[in-house]
Interface confidence: low
């Protein structure tokens, strides 16, 4: 079955259908008579029970809370409750980019080596029965592909294949037309024994935090075996007892390259942790690449343009 929504923090684009599926679904079927409730809270607002009367955009089906569509004011915390089982999600609804066919903050980056097998298949299992047609766009220009239900690209990668690929599913619900967009930033890299290491994701990340809480900054890179990934912060690393570098995780690819991930954990965030650079660097004989994180107090979020924000 469609996997339940296990991620506790979710970012979604306004105007698209969206659903939350709780993770005790099989259990809920067995206990049909058990009271099952969905709640929302946002800001100072207390838990408000959700039902189809709450909004014409909300639908409840078995294990799922559906939004038709999700809008900016749906941002908040959502709870599912059944007997002594509770599941919580934090939903952040972001503005759609009206000047593009996709929203930059909702792009999945993938790296494909030149001459290696390259494939994009447009599928959306949850809404499959409602989808009328699906289109695949490259850099917001529609690609003419035979199959308009599940358009697919299968080929050996060339440098010309680099770009933004958007799968757009068009579907009807209660007489209205909706679309769901999934976009991939495909980067084609040289097929060679040593790659130029690259950090994944934006170069500058503003992270909204609350004082006294904890945050985990994740730094991921594609690199060679002998390359190193490290964090730099403050005048002297290790001076803050609340900052901890977690153990580096590495997974090898068949080509002998590595995907590495290193987390910087900041506990009990204080004023001294705000508005300073936490730099993650990947270094190799071929050069270095650095990305930066800046912690910003949640109350100050409004001062920063939305496009530079990250979760």
């Amino acid at each position: 079955a469609e996997s339940c929504t296990s991620r506790p923090h979710i970012t979604v684009v306004e105007g698209e259908p969206f659903y939350l599926k709780h993770c005790s679904c099989s259990l809920a079927h067995e206990i049909e008579t058990t009271t099952k409730s969905w709640y929302k809270s946002s800001g100072s607002q207390e838990h408000v029970e959700l039902n189809p009367r709450s909004s014409s955009r909300i639908a409840l089906h078995d294990c799922v809370l559906e939004f038709w569509p999700v809008e900016l004011n749906d941002t908040g915390s959502y709870f599912f409750q059944m007997k002594n089982y509770t599941q919580k999600w934090k939903l952040n609804v972001i503005r759609r980019n009206k000047h593009s066919c996709f929203t930059e903050r909702q792009v999945t980056s993938k790296i494909v080596e030149v001459k290696k097998f390259f494939q994009i298949t447009c599928e959306n299992s949850y809404y499959q029965t409602l989808v009328n047609s699906t289109s695949l766009y490259k850099n917001c220009k529609k690609l003419l592909l035979e199959n308009n239900k599940n358009p697919t690209i299968k080929k050996n990668a060339e440098f010309e294949d680099q770009g933004y690929y958007s799968c757009v599913h068009f579907l009807h619900h209660n007489g209205k037309l909706f679309n769901i967009t999934k976009t991939f930033n495909i980067t084609i890299v040289e097929d060679r024994s040593n790659i130029v290491p690259v950090l994944l994701g934006p170069k500058l990340n503003h992270v909204a935090v609350e004082l006294g809480k904890n945050v985990r900054l994740n730094c991921s890179a594609l690199l060679n075996e002998e390359d190193v990934i490290y964090w730099m912060f403050g005048e002297e690393n290790g001076s803050d007892p609340n900052i901890h570098e977690e153990k580096e995780m590495r997974i090898m690819t068949p080509e002998g390259k590595w995907h590495a991930s290193k987390v910087l954990r900041i506990e009990n965030i204080g004023e001294s942790n705000l508005n300073v650079l936490y730099n993650c660097t990947v270094a190799s004989t071929g050069g270095t690449d650095t990305k930066s994180f800046i912690l910003v107090r949640k109350a100050d979020m409004a001062d920063i343009p939305g496009h530079v924000f990250t979760r």
């Epitope: 079955a1 469609e2 996997s3 991620r7 999945t108 993938k110 790296i111 494909v112 080596e113 290696k116 097998f117 390259f118 494939q119 994009i120 298949t121 599928e123 299992s125 599940n150 697919t152 299968k154 990668a157 999934k182 991939f184 495909i186 594609l222 997974i251 690819t253 068949p254 080509e255 390259k257 995907h259």
Partner: nanobody, 126 residues
Framework: EVQLVESGGGLVQPGGSLRLSCAAS????????ISWFRQAPGQEREVVSC????????IYADSVKGRFTISSDNAKNTVYLQMNSLKPEDTAVYYC???????????????????WGQGTQVTVSS
């Protein structure tokens, strides 16, 4: 409807072998990345191995390299995990997962899967 059904788990002595199967349906099998994850009690879920049936990419976590082998049978839409030289620390619930937006090459098993199976218990004990 997408389905991932695992089988083959059980109790085995240290040094023994098991073969896990993951039968997939409801999506384009050769356009996906199929991963095996595991979760031991009180531990975080970790990726063990991944295969892309479309391009033959395979990856392994360091802890299982040389002991585990992942393979796929495209005709049966099934992925196998052959586990040899099992150790007590391999004890966990093993989950099959699918990333149906896989696009080839280096990212097998690294993105959050779209779908998960129910899991099968593997216990290594004397």
């Amino acid at each position: 409807e997408v389905q991932l059904v695992e089988s083959g788990g059980g109790l085995v002595q240290p040094g023994g072998s098991l073969r896990l199967s993951c039968a997939a349906s409801g999506f384009t099998f050769d356009g996906a990345a199929i991963s095996w994850f595991r979760q031991a009690p009180g531990q975080e879920r970790e990726v063990v191995s991944c295969v892309s049936p479309g391009d033959g990419t395979t990856i392994y976590a360091d802890s299982v390299k040389g002991r585990f082998t992942i393979s796929s049978d495209n005709a049966k839409n099934t992925v196998y995990l052959q586990m040899n030289s099992l150790k007590p620390e391999d004890t966990a619930v093993y989950y099959c997962a699918a990333d149906t937006y896989y696009s080839g090459g280096a990212h097998c098993g690294l993105l959050s899967p779209d779908y998960w199976g129910q899991g099968t218990q593997v216990t290594v004990s004397s």
